[in-house]
Amino acid sequence: LKGQEFAPSHQQVYAPLRADGDKPRAHLTVVRQTPTQHFKNQFPALHWEHELGLAFTKNRMNYTNKFLLIPESGDYFIYSQVTFRGMTSECSEIRQAGRPNKPDSITVVITKVTDSYPEPTQLLMGTKSVCEVGSNWFQPIYLGAMFSLQEGDKLMVNVSDISLVDYTKEDKTFFGAFLL
Amino acid sequence: LKGQEFAPSHQQVYAPLRADGDKPRAHLTVVRQTPTQHFKNQFPALHWEHELGLAFTKNRMNYTNKFLLIPESGDYFIYSQVTFRGMTSECSEIRQAGRPNKPDSITVVITKVTDSYPEPTQLLMGTKSVCEVGSNWFQPIYLGAMFSLQEGDKLMVNVSDISLVDYTKEDKTFFGAFLL
Amino acid sequence: LKGQEFAPSHQQVYAPLRADGDKPRAHLTVVRQTPTQHFKNQFPALHWEHELGLAFTKNRMNYTNKFLLIPESGDYFIYSQVTFRGMTSECSEIRQAGRPNKPDSITVVITKVTDSYPEPTQLLMGTKSVCEVGSNWFQPIYLGAMFSLQEGDKLMVNVSDISLVDYTKEDKTFFGAFLL
């Protein structure tokens, strides 16, 4: 029976039991970003801390050059929060000037890159219009979901504007994944 | 090594297999809060329901006096949502009066307390400026991520203003953790 | 005892080990919704994609007619994000007309239906007042938590207004659950 395991002793060949403690896992935290060039229609990717403070990678889950590397095929829960902060948005400036009221926005995308596939895949997107009355605004966007990933897949977090990301605290902006 | 673990094939000796059903888990739900004294620069902690309705604790994960007690070292997924509600924020009142436009804010922090360490550790923070036009506003802040915890660690949820927390429904404001 | 389990050492008899890969799991993604009739005080449920693109169901977790069917009792992590978008909210129109300033709102509810129980149970709710200055607004509501479910339970996602749901991209609006 697929979902019940009063299994014959040879079932481990097909779906081996494994200790939970040796599953690939990572929790990355924000670091100061350096402005980078990026294509006009492509959101820039964030850099992350992989070992200091609350951050860690374990069991062959490695971080390299903005990417989390998936070391083993399976179903992963992937999550990220990005806290944005800025001054009064253009939206309210435009509004005061009586021009058409087009809101600004903030966006986070968790993206999968597969070497064998030419286009990145957007797994998760959180996007929000920002049309604040206050002169200084700040707010988080949180994302999390489960995906089937293949060994060798790479994950990154892209944002609409790196200069608006709050990199001051490791608990405000973070990115993680773990094999279920 | 914190950031890398290339484990020998006999690791199961150190990380034994275990039934998923006996892992420490808790889902706590909101209760009416009693105003409590707290230090000026420290956010107050919320009380929680641990057994009625949707709430539960199991497998040695205990709730006591605002804290979730971690009974076993390992990697935990920790989450919380707090729904806030209030009247027109001071921000818009200040704005109408022509004074400097400093926004109010709402903040949730999931905090870890370790008896051997003098200072609490902020694991997760969700913080948002509130500068609403409407006379009554309400909104949730959601947080969730994975952390390596030690037996004996205690978790709590702190908020910037207890009086703004919506305690009317167990599905609006909650706090949980489970061993991965 | 619901809240406490001091289990005997032979508990594995009752909670057998099982391969993680054969646990019930689903990630559903948004599809275009058809306007449906619903009772005045009951939020409409969303339809979902269960196999195309990023969506999948596996290990007896089935999707049928707006519902995720729970095939096995246990503790599940359940999550959803709904991205809403709309034109200027009534709130600001009301405000301009000088009438009482009652904010609009957007709400997501993850609901459990148990055949043996007459009333659905609201597991998670995310609700937010919408009183936007900009003419076009958009924003996500994210929810996620762990619940003890019984075989045969059904899960659905209800929203306050189907016409405001952004169904354009599978990464913006989604719904998932997995057995822990």
């Epitope: 935290t29 670091v31 100061r32 970003q33 350096t34 850099h47 801390e49 992989h50 070992e51 200091l52 403070g53 609350l54 390299t64 050059n65 990199y167 001051t168 605290k169 490791e170 608990d171 | 090594l1 914190k2 950031g3 890398q4 360490y117 200072e119 609490p120 550790t121 902020q122 694991l123 | -």
Partner: antibody, heavy 123, light 107 residues
Framework: QVQLQQSGPGLVKPSQTLSLTCAIS??????????WNWIRQSPSRGLEWLGR?????????DYAVSVKSRLTINPDTSKNQFSLQLNSVTPEDTAVYYC?????????????WGQGTLVPVSS | DIQMTQSPSSLSASVGDRVTITCRAS??????LNWYQQTPGKAPKLLIY???SLQSGVPSRFSGSGSGTYFTLTISSLQPEDLATYYC?????????FGQGTKVEIK
């Protein structure tokens, strides 16, 4: 411009405690974009990282296994400095000791160093 | 701990020569690799960070390349003031580890 100024005695007897201080100017010991490190150099061991202190959500310390049981690194926020205490020294601990800032961002590197303190361990 | 192995341990070259120093790591860590120059009696000075980025104020004759486990430092045209010992260092894993050094002498 960041500057690190080291101070401490230049000679320590075996079994005693080696104490050095590194005063920071142009940055803060509580910075979330740096770690504050001690590194030593000897002909036999080359450049050897000893440990660090840094602040994120709280203060953290990390130490090299070779000195973990004997080494304490403490930050002093009021004076914007950090210190090294190495207990029970032996002649093997004879080295030039450096403090260094590790800049933390997309990359990590020791971009500023103290001037170095030669510490002979001798009776 | 990650072992960093430099070669050669010393070299002698003439002014104007192109000089290459290599650094091998016992484990891959992408581009978290730095190069330092140390002149006698002074503290090490950062030359190259992130394998190939030139630190501000460092002459452009210095360059770095490589990723994973194999890295190189190149001095395109050796100058008299380049007489020093050069160290590689990985900054991905804790503890931080350095190569044993390459002493560059002028013929």
């Amino acid at each position: 411009q960041v500057q690190l100024q080291q101070s401490g005695p230049g000679l320590v007897k075996p079994s005693q405690t080696l104490s050095l201080t590194c005063a920071i100017s142009g940055d803060s010991v509580s910075s979330n974009s740096a770690t504050w490190n001690w590194i030593r150099q000897s002909p036999s061991r080359g450049l050897e990282w000893l440990g660090r202190t840094y602040y994120r959500s709280k203060w953290y310390n990390d130490y090299a296994v070779s000195v973990k049981s004997r080494l304490t690194i403490n930050p002093d926020t009021s004076k914007n400095q950090f210190s090294l205490q190495l207990n029970s020294v032996t002649p093997e601990d004879t080295a030039v000791y450096y403090c260094a800032r590790e800049a933390v961002g997309p990359t990590k590197d020791f971009d500023y160093w103290g001037q170095g303190t030669l510490v002979p361990v001798s009776s | 701990d990650i072992q960093m192995t430099q070669s050669p341990s010393s070299l002698s070259a003439s002014v104007g020569d192109r000089v290459t120093i290599t650094c091998r790591a016992s484990q891959s860590f992408s581009s978290y690799l730095n190069w330092y120059q140390q002149t006698p009696g002074k503290a090490p000075k950062l030359l190259i960070y992130a394998a190939s980025s030139l630190q501000s104020g460092v002459p452009s004759r210095f360059s770095g390349s490589g990723s994973g486990t194999y890295f190189t430092l190149t001095i395109s045209s050796l100058q008299p003031e380049d007489l020093a010992t050069y160290y590689c260092q990985q900054s991905y894993f804790t503890p931080r580890t350095f190569g044993q050094g390459t002493k560059v002498e002028i013929k």
